[in-house]
């Protein structure tokens, strides 16, 4: 059967049952995911907007799939095996009375069972297993998975020791404090810094230690994942986002219609198929576009490329290059260049590197 081909899995609670406090629902669902993460390399994180891998829904009767609920009793919940769209989603019958204890139907115990399905497990014939098809209350304070449950889930995902860092081909949420973390694109947006990676972005509000991870699609549903370059013209409230040979314009955090457009409208020659990084310098009103080992300079007022470009990155940015992943402008005098897991604070007035940092140094790692 299907399995998640990644170890970082997001979930979202779409709506809340009125039978319980919201905090109790959050806690029951979190603890249910924890039951499975304790015995596998899987890591689960809750997101509040956008497309999660696993959507938790409370619904009654017909609710958007072929498997309508049947009122109180009978079917308590169902969940779809791993996959895109409805894949992984767990639906709980709102006609049940959901509780934190032995009365009604215990949400935690039901969720452990349904999340088992969300992860790819079928039913067990062992009456002691949480994946046994019928509901039976057990003391949640002493609850443990049966040997059969553990055997089943570890046959799909392995045990927790196998949690060595995986490459990220499937756009699972990267670990923010992984020392090897690199970014696809970085830009300021007002007093915030956006760090893009795969289908996610982190939001860092200046001078505050807290950062939050979000799906790009939750903020801008029409934009693709894998943004490769980004820059801001703050005076115009504009952000430009690049992927492949296309770019999108965001004005006041809203995507403009009639985008994407071709990057060649900036005046790049045809051989340029994508932009690695971009940064706007408001002092000179110029945007620097980095492509492989070269860069172009674009005059935002005249809307045309400056003559004499491209130039080699290594020639004009001492100690930077030959290629970069991302760059942003800050504090009126610095470019922050990102190369893999390293970051360089570059004083463009002194024209030299003033600090070497890890790429994720902004997150208090």
């Amino acid at each position: 059967g299907p399995v998640w081909r990644k170890h970082y899995i997001t979930y979202r609670i779409n709506n809340y049952t009125p039978d319980m406090n919201r905090e109790d629902v959050d806690y029951a669902i979190r603890k249910a995911f924890q039951v499975w993460s304790n015995v596998t390399p899987l890591k689960f994180s809750k997101i509040n907007t956008g497309m999660a891998d696993i959507l938790v829904v409370f619904a009654r009767g017909a609710h958007g799939d072929f498997h309508a609920f049947d009122g109180k009793g009978g079917i308590l919940a169902h969940a779809f095996g791993p996959g895109s769209g409805i894949g992984g989603d767990a639906h709980f019958d709102e006609d049940e009375f959901w509780t934190t204890h032995s009365g009604g139907t215990n949400l935690f115990l039901t969720a452990v069972h349904e999340i088992g399905h969300s992860l790819g497990l079928g039913h067990s014939s062992d009456p002691k297993a949480v994946m046994f098809p019928t509901y039976k209350y057990v003391d949640i304070n002493t609850f443990r998975l049966s040997a059969d449950d553990i055997r089943g889930i570890q046959s799909l995902y392995g045990d927790p020791k196998e949690n060595q860092r995986l490459p990220n081909p499937d756009n699972s949420e990267p670990a923010l404090c992984d020392p090897n973390l690199s970014f696809d694109a970085v830009t300021t947006v007002g007093n915030k810094i956006f760090f893009f990676k795969d289908r996610f972005f982190w939001l860092k509000v200046s001078e505050r230690p807290k950062t939050s991870v979000n799906l790009i699609s939750s903020l801008w549903p029409t934009l693709p994942s894998g943004i490769e370059a980004a820059y801001e013209i703050e005076a115009r409230n504009q952000v430009f986002l690049f992927k492949d040979d296309k770019y999108w314009l965001i004005s006041n955090l809203r995507p403009e219609p009639n985008y994407p457009k071709s990057i060649h409208s900036f005046g790049f020659p045809n051989f340029v198929k994508k932009i690695d990084a971009a940064v706007f310098n408001p002092r000179f009103y110029r945007t620097y576009f980095f492509v492989d080992n070269q860069y172009w300079r674009y005059d935002e007022r005249r809307q045309m490329m400056d003559p004499g470009y491209p130039k080699l990155i290594t020639k004009n940015f001492q100690g930077i290059g030959p290629k970069i992943d991302a760059v942003f402008y800050s504090k009126n005098k610095y470019y922050y260049f990102f190369q893999g897991s390293n970051q360089f604070e570059y004083d463009f007035l002194l024209q030299r590197i003033t600090k070497t940092l890890k790429s994720n140094s902004w997150f208090g790692c």
């Epitope: 059967g1 299907p2 779409n14 497309m51 959507l55 829904v57 619904a59 609710h63 958007g64 799939d65 072929f66 498997h67 169902h78 969940a79 779809f80 095996g81 996959g83 895109s84 769209g85 409805i86 894949g87 989603d89 399905h117 079928g122 699609s217 549903p221």
Partner: antibody
Framework: EVQLLESGGGLVQPGGSLRLSCAAS????????MHWVRQAPGKGLEWVSG????????FYADSVKGRFTISRDNSKNTLYLQMNSLRAEDTAVYYC???????????????WGRGTLVTVSS | DIQMTQSPSSLSASVGDRVTITCRAN??????LNWYQQKPGKAPELLIY???SLQSGVPSRFSGSGSGTDFTLTISSLQPEDFATYYC?????FGQGTKLEIK
């Protein structure tokens, strides 16, 4: 390459019966939900029936409940629709469609056959 | 029971136009909405699933958005091959269809 090939359509009188078949190839048939969807001439699409991987559960549109029976033979990679007590309003092109999922149906049809025409007329 | 209302039922547009088709459910269907394209005499083809995910091989000028009850299919710049009928669908319920014709 995934292929779904419907057969068994034709002209039948009101009250008559017909059995449609859908031969599947290019994918492992047994784990997936399968469905029948129809389209009356010049009209829109109407879902008719769906069946789970091992022959159950089965679901039907209200308009065909009690008259049509969906079944499958996983050893032959074939889906069937037995249509009894046919009415003029059952005249349509009948498509066989593969669901993207097993276990529970997502109702997401990633592959369709070319259809077979059923005409109910006296 | 869940019902899907698709609008408009027909639409005339020119090559290069941006076109939007909407689909509304009478109750929340989360993001469980799919869009299909059908050309005359052909079987429908899946374009968008789960409201906004582009099916493999479908051009990026097609995009979907929405959740809950309101959904849209957008074609950013119409191409000659896009003139067809479009259906939204959720489980066993299809919208009435939108016929997109050349102006």
């Amino acid at each position: 390459e995934v292929q779904l090939l419907e057969s068994g359509g034709g002209l039948v009188q009101p009250g008559g019966s017909l059995r449609l078949s859908c031969a599947a190839s290019g994918f492992t048939f047994s784990p997936y939900w399968m469905h029948w969807v129809r389209q009356a001439p010049g009209k829109g699409l109407e879902w008719v029936s769906g069946i789970g991987p091992s022959g159950g559960p089965t679901f039907y549109a209200d308009s065909v409940k009690g008259r049509f029976t969906i079944s499958r033979d996983n050893s032959k990679n074939t889906l069937y629709l037995q249509m009894n007590s046919l009415r003029a309003e059952d005249t349509a092109v009948y498509y066989c469609a593969k669901d993207i999922r097993g276990a529970y149906s997502s109702g997401l049809f990633d592959y369709w056959g070319r259809g077979t025409l059923v005409t109910v007329s006296s | 029971d869940i019902q899907m209302t698709q609008s408009p039922s027909s639409l005339s547009a020119s090559v290069g136009d941006r076109v939007t088709i909407t689909c509304r459910a009478n109750q929340s269907i989360y993001t469980y909405l799919n869009w299909y394209q059908q050309k005359p005499g052909k079987a429908p083809e899946l374009l968008i699933y789960a409201a906004s995910s582009l099916q493999s091989g479908v051009p990026s000028r097609f995009s979907g958005s929405g959740s809950g009850t309101d959904f849209t299919l957008t074609i950013s710049s119409l191409q000659p091959e896009d003139f067809a009928t479009y259906y939204c669908q959720q489980a066993g319920i299809f919208g009435q269809g939108t016929k997109l014709e050349i102006k």
